[in-house]
C-alpha cells in the first residue's frame, strides 16, 4: 500500500480468482483513543471499532472511502483504490491501446518544434468518474524539470457502438535548448483513476523522435506563361524552430487528381518553391519534415489547381 | 526516403556537401546495424545514450547559432579554446567562434574515426563475421576531415591485447552509431547555417 495523495491510498493486488489479497491496517487521524467506529462509503454498518481497523482487501467491494467516527462526528477519511497486477503485468483497463506506432501504445506525444514543448494524448471509452494527473521529467535517476498542465478532454468521437474520449495535456521542459543533443529521454507518467481502480501509464521519448512540424503556410500557386506548369510556393510554419537555416525542413509536393486512384506525382525539395504540372480538377499539397532527422511528416497543406 | 541529392555549386560553403554525405552514410550504417543485429539491443529505446566526445569537445555550444545565444539554457557550458585555421573558412570575416566551431567538429570526427577503426578491427576477428563498418562511412568521415583541414595531433589507434567480447563490441557499435548520427545531424545543421550566413 502507498499514498497517492493526502488520505488516498493505492493497494496493489495480485489479481486472480481466490487470491488472498492484502491485509491493510487503517489508522484514524485523531488524538482520540476510544469510542471510535469505522464505516465504508455510504453504509452505516459498523465495520469495527478502535483507533485502527484491519481489513483484508481482495476485490473492489473492499475498496472505497473508509471513515472513522466518534459520537456521530467524522474524524478522518481514507480512500482505498486498487491497482491490479495480472500475471506480473499491471492492468491497462482504463486507456485504449492506440496501436500506433506499435502495440501497447497508450500515450502518444508530439512536438511542433525543438523548444521543449510537447503535447501528449490518450483515449478511453469511459465517460464518468475518471480523473488523470500527469507528471513529467527529463531522465529518471536524476530528473530535470518538465512542467505539465492539467489533462483536459480534447475530443469526443463515435467509434461503432462506442463513444471514444480523447484527453490531452501540454508540457514544457523547464530549461530547454533547441539545439541540444538529447541523451536522456523525457519521461511522462499519467495516473488514471476510474471509480476505485488506479492505473498508471508511462511514455519515454526524445523530443527529436516526436517532432511533427505544422503544415507549411501561405501555400500559393503562380501559373507560368504559355505552360501547364505552375510555380508552387510556401513558407515555413510559424511554430517551427528558428533560425530556419539551422533548423531546416525538407518538403514533399504532391499533385493529386480528384480520384484517389489517380497516380500521384511527388517531388521532394529543400526549397520553399517547386514547379509542377497542374492537372484539371487536381489539387496540390505540400508537407514538411525535419531535413536532417527523419521524424514525422507534417499534415498536408493543400490548394486546388483551379 | 526518396529525396533527390542536391549537388552543391562551386561557390557553396565547401563542407556542406561532405556533411550531407556524412549524415546519409551514418544513417545507412545505423539502419544496417539495426537489421543485422536484430537480436541485440540496438534500438534507440534499448541502448544507453553515451557521447564519447563529452567533456572533450563542445560542438553544440561552440556552433550555436547567434539567434540562440540569447537562450540561457543553451549557454550552460560555453567553452572557448581550440585551433583557428581551416579551409572551410571561406572568408576572412569568419569569426573566432566559427573557427572554434569547425575545429570542434574536426575533433569529433577524429575521435569517432579512431573508435570506429578500433571497433572494425575487432569485428573482423569475429568468427560469425556478422557486421563490419561501412567503408563508405569511414571514407566520408575522412573527406570531411580533409575539407575541414585542421592541423591536429594524430590520435593513435587503440589496440587491445585481450580477447574481444563480440557481443559487447556489437552493442558498443550500436551505441556509437546512435551517438554519431545525432552528432552528424548537428554538424549538418551547422554547415547549413554557416552556408546561409
Amino acid at each position: 500500500i502507498w499514498e497517492l495523495k493526502k488520505d488516498v491510498y493505492v493497494v496493489e493486488l495480485d489479481w486472480y480468482p481466490d487470491a488472498p489479497g492484502e491485509m491493510v491496517v487503517l489508522t484514524c487521524d485523531t488524538p482520540e483513543e476510544d469510542g471510535i467506529t469505522w464505516t465504508l462509503d455510504q453504509s452505516s454498518e459498523v465495520l469495527g471499532s478502535g483507533k485502527t481497523l484491519t481489513i483484508q482487501v481482495k476485490e473492489f467491494g473492499d475498496a472505497g472511502q473508509y471513515t472513522c467516527h466518534k459520537g456521530g462526528e467524522v474524524l478522518s477519511h481514507s480512500l482505498l483504490l486498487l491497482h491490479k497486477k495480472e500475471d506480473g503485468i499491471w492492468s491497462t483497463d482504463i486507456l485504449k491501446d492506440q496501436k500506433e506506432p506499435k502495440n501497447k501504445t497508450f500515450l502518444r506525444c508530439e512536438a511542433k518544434n525543438y523548444s521543449g514543448r510537447f503535447t501528449c494524448w490518450w483515449l478511453t471509452t469511459i465517460s464518468t468518474d475518471l480523473t488523470f494527473s500527469v507528471k513529467s521529467s527529463r531522465g529518471s535517476s536524476d530528473p530535470q524539470g518538465v512542467t505539465c498542465g492539467a489533462a483536459t478532454l480534447s475530443a469526443e468521437r463515435v467509434r461503432g457502438d462506442n463513444k471514444e474520449y480523447e484527453y490531452s495535456v501540454e508540457c514544457q521542459e523547464d530549461s530547454a535548448c533547441p539545439a541540444a543533443e538529447e541523451s536522456l529521454p523525457i519521461e511522462v507518467m499519467v495516473d488514471a483513476v476510474h471509480k476505485l481502480k488506479y492505473e498508471n501509464y508511462t511514455s519515454s521519448f526524445f523530443i527529436r523522435d516526436i517532432i511533427k512540424p505544422d503544415p507549411p503556410k501561405n501555400l500559393q500557386l503562380k501559373p507560368l506563361k504559355n505552360s501547364r506548369q505552375v510555380e508552387v510556393s510556401w513558407e515555413y510554419p510559424d511554430t517551427w524552430s528558428t533560425p530556419h537555416s539551422y533548423f531546416s525542413l525538407t518538403f514533399c509536393v504532391q499533385v493529386q487528381g480528384k480520384s484517389k486512384r489517380e497516380k500521384k506525382d511527388r517531388v521532394f525539395t529543400d526549397k520553399t518553391s517547386a514547379t509542377v504540372i497542374c492537372r484539371k480538377n487536381a489539387s496540390i499539397s505540400v508537407r514538411a519534415q525535419d531535413r536532417y532527422y527523419s521524424s514525422s511528416w507534417s499534415e498536408w497543406a493543400s490548394v486546388p489547381c483551379s | 526516403r526518396n529525396l533527390p541529392v542536391a549537388t552543391p555549386d562551386p561557390g557553396m560553403f565547401p563542407c556542406l556537401h561532405h556533411s550531407q554525405n556524412l549524415l546519409r552514410a551514418v544513417s545507412n550504417m545505423l539502419q544496417k546495424a539495426r537489421q543485422t543485429l536484430e537480436f541485440y539491443p540496438c534500438t534507440s529505446e534499448e541502448i544507453d545514450h553515451e557521447d564519447i566526445t563529452k567533456d572533450k569537445t563542445s560542438t553544440v555550444e561552440a556552433c550555436l547559432p547567434l539567434e540562440l545565444t540569447k537562450n540561457e539554457s543553451c549557454l550552460n557550458s560555453r567553452e572557448t579554446s581550440f585551433i583557428t585555421n581551416g579551409s572551410c573558412l571561406a572568408s576572412r570575416k569568419t569569426s573566432f567562434m566559427m573557427a572554434l566551431c569547425l575545429s570542434s567538429i574536426y575533433e569529433d570526427l577524429k575521435m569517432y574515426q579512431v573508435e570506429f577503426k578500433t571497433m572494425n578491427a575487432k569485428l573482423l576477428m569475429d568468427p560469425k563475421r556478422q557486421i563490419f563498418l561501412d567503408q563508405n562511412m569511414l571514407a566520408v568521415i575522412d573527406e570531411l576531415m580533409q575539407a575541414l583541414n585542421f592541423n591536429s595531433e594524430t590520435v593513435p589507434q587503440k589496440s587491445s591485447l585481450e580477447e574481444p567480447d563480440f557481443y559487447k563490441t556489437k552493442i558498443k557499435l550500436c551505441i556509437l552509431l546512435h551517438a554519431f548520427r545525432i552528432r552528424a545531424v548537428t554538424i549538418d545543421r551547422v554547415m547549413s547555417y554557416l552556408n546561409a550566413s
Partner: antibody, heavy 115, light 112 residues
Framework: QVQLVQSGGGVVQPGRSLRLSCAAS????????MHWVRQAPGKGLEWVAF????????YYADSVKGRFTISRDNSKNTLYLQMKSLRAEDTAVYYC????????WGQGTMVTVSS | SYVLTQPPSVSGTPGQRVTISCSGG????????VKWYQQLPGTAPKLLIY???QRPSGVPDRFSGSKSGTSASLAITGVQAEDEADYYC????????????FGTGTKVTVLG
Amino acid sequence: QVQLVQSGGGVVQPGRSLRLSCAASGFTFSSYGMHWVRQAPGKGLEWVAFIRYDGSNKYYADSVKGRFTISRDNSKNTLYLQMKSLRAEDTAVYYCKTHGSHDNWGQGTMVTVSS
Amino acid sequence: SYVLTQPPSVSGTPGQRVTISCSGGRSNIGSQTVKWYQQLPGTAPKLLIYGNDQRPSGVPDRFSGSKSGTSASLAITGVQAEDEADYYCQSYDRGTHPALLFGTGTKVTVLG
C-alpha cells in the same frame, strides 16, 4: 473453490460450426479475464483467444482470427467460444482458463473435425 | 509458430537433478515473467511455477524455476517417478500481450 466446467465438444464436419461453453463458479467471474487454449492430439499447448473481464477487448491467435469468436455472459458466469468454418487442423482438446499469476483450468473438451 | 524453444525430452533416474531449458527473446522472456506447467496424460496442465521462480502452495519444493536474460529453466532436484509428464514454459510477448506464448514442451522420463 474455483471451478470451470466445460461443455459443447463433439464431432463436426469441416466447414461447420460448434459452440463451446465454460461455466464458472466459486469466484467473481465478472472480475477476471479468460482464455481459451487448445491441444491437438500428441501436440503442445496453443493459445486460442482471450477476453477482458468486461468483454470490452478480445484477442485471437492468427490461426483462428475471423473464424472463432470469444464471448462471455457475466450474468450467467459463462465463457463461450463460437467456432465457424472448422478445419481438420482445429481438431484438439479445448481448455478454458482464468487469467492471472495463479490460474485455474477447465477439464477440457474434445473437438474433432472430420468428414 | 512456437517462439519459446524447449528440448523435446529429458530423462533421469530417481533422485537425480533434471533441468529443462526454455529459450526465447528480448520481447518475451527477456522482458516478461515465465510460468511452468506440468501435464500428466489425459489431464489439464497444472501450474508449477509463476513469476519466474515462485511456487504456488501445494507444489513440492523439489521444483524450482529461474530466469536469466532471454532464457528460463525448470529444475527438478531429486526427480521421482510421479514427475514423469510433459512440461511447458509460458510467457508473453510485450507487443502481443495478453496472448499466451507456450514453449514447445518437454517430455520428462524417469528411468529405472
